[in-house]
Interface confidence: low
Amino acid sequence: HNTTVFQGVAGQSLQVSCPYDSMKHWGRRKAWCRQLGEKGPCQRVVSTHNLWLLSFLRRWNGSTAITDDTLGGTLTITLRNLQPHDAGLYQCQSLHGSEADTLRKVLVEVLADPLDHRDAGDLWFPGESESFEDAHVEHSISRSLLEGEIPFPPTSILLLLACIFLIKILAASALWAAAWHGQKPGTHPPSELDCGHDPGYQLQTLPGLRDT
């Protein structure tokens, strides 16, 4: 595996993306771990939801979040309020049983943020606060994500919404058909359950989908 470098600015958020083959890693949970030394173990930082179908839900461990677009095949890790000690070698992993496949090796580098102390949080160059009144600054790092903030919904969420919409249409059609034929609608078959209460419930009955 080649190592991909992601650079972030101290005090801001860094988003790390790990693309993978969504078919090959179908049904597998993912994890983000920190490499301890060149030959040391990879220490788990955060992993996706225990229910694979809920992998799109962002999970936090301290200032690190993970979310998985299982259909699009992109694992996204957010390191919020990046600190100098966050720099180092990490791995995106795909879990199966007690084994883990490396999806991507990531080197996180933390660049100094010599901007205004009041806004920047952890500044690695405290002498810089007065020096940047007139300096030209190019910001290539996106703004920090708030903890409750949800980015653009991944493919899996869109699919679930489509599922809900489709099931409701089917249920309405069945009710309409029953009414048209003058029959009393009986108990709903499983296919008509409203998956809005548990977005993963309906899809969990599909073959091959299980939490590993």
């Epitope: 650079q7 600015v9 101290a10 600190q83 100098p84 000690h85 720099a87 580098e109 933390v110 660049l111 100094a112 010599p114 102390h117 920047a120 949080g121 952890d122 500044l123 690695w124 160059f125 405290p126 002498g127 020096s131 940047f132 300096a135 030209h136 600054v137 190019e138 910001h139 290539s140």
Partner: antibody, heavy 122, light 113 residues
Framework: EVKLLESGGGLVQPGGSMRLSCAAS????????MNWIRQPAGKAPEWLGL??????????EYNPSVKGRFTISRDNTQDMLYLQMNTLRAEDTATYYC?????????????WGQGVMVTVSS | DILINQSPASLTVSAGEKVTVSCKSS????????????LAWYQQKPGQFPKLLIY???YRHTGVPDRFTGSGSGTDFTLTISSVQAEDLAHYYC?????????FGAGTKLELK
């Protein structure tokens, strides 16, 4: 491997000018703050100034002791750092080093060049 | 400018001895927002350029032997060599990077008996 190599030193008369160069290799030059430091024989180093990285517009910071006489610049296409020294005085005689501020290093200088000797004398 | 008072100016020790070098700054080098102290230690062997030993007051630079330890916070800092080796013969300098201009201590010359 990170390497910094200074050149351009030598003997210059008081009141004269000199330009020092520092060739950088082994790292992404535009990502780093670059510094000049000098050290008179038998004395402690003296920080002269720095030039910031691409993200911060390659702006400069100087020690008041040399501000107005010394100018730091960089050529990012050639991975070169420069120190232009004007109106040189005898007290500017020293070994001059270029050095890099490391990422995550709190402003400290993680790599230095071998240094180049500048002698200001008539 | 922040003034750095480094002591002692010189030390003569035997191999295996423990050595401590002190640096005191004229103002605190602890930046509360990052909870970091902005002090570095350098080693300069005769005829060579300075090499970074310790940054952020206590973080050992890559490849630096663990007999070198940096400690302290605020205005008082210490470099400790737990068991001096022959190759440690050098000048040692501390440097503050809390505010411009960055300033160095006058240095400590470590000699072996």
């Amino acid at each position: 491997e990170v390497k910094l190599l200074e050149s351009g030193g030598g003997l210059v008369q008081p009141g004269g000018s000199m330009r020092l160069s520092c060739a950088a290799s082994g790292f992404t030059f535009t990502d780093f703050y670059m510094n000049w430091i000098r050290q008179p024989a038998g004395k402690a180093p003296e920080w002269l100034g720095l030039i910031r990285n691409k993200a911060y517009g390659y702006t400069t910071e100087y020690n008041p002791s040399v501000k107005g006489r010394f100018t730091i610049s960089r050529d990012n296409t050639q991975d070169m750092l420069y120190l232009q020294m004007n109106t040189l005085r005898a007290e500017d005689t020293a070994t001059y080093y270029c050095a890099r501020i490391g990422i995550n290093y709190g402003g400290s200088l993680d790599y230095w060049g071998q240094g180049v000797m500048v002698t200001v004398s008539s | 400018d922040i003034l750095i008072n480094q002591s002692p100016a010189s030390l003569t020790v035997s191999a295996g001895e423990k050595v401590t070098v002190s640096c005191k700054s004229s103002q605190s080098l602890l930046y509360s927002e990052s909870n970091q102290d902005y002090l570095a230690w350098y080693q300069q062997k005769p005829g060579q350029f300075p090499k970074l030993l310790i940054y952020g007051a206590s973080y050992r630079h890559t490849g630096v032997p663990d007999r070198f330890t940096g400690s302290g916070s605020g205005t008082d800092f210490t470099l400790t060599i737990s068991s001096v080796q022959a190759e440690d013969l050098a000048h040692y300098y501390c440097e503050q990077t809390y505010s411009y201009p960055y300033t160095f201590g006058a240095g400590t010359k470590l000699e072996l008996k």
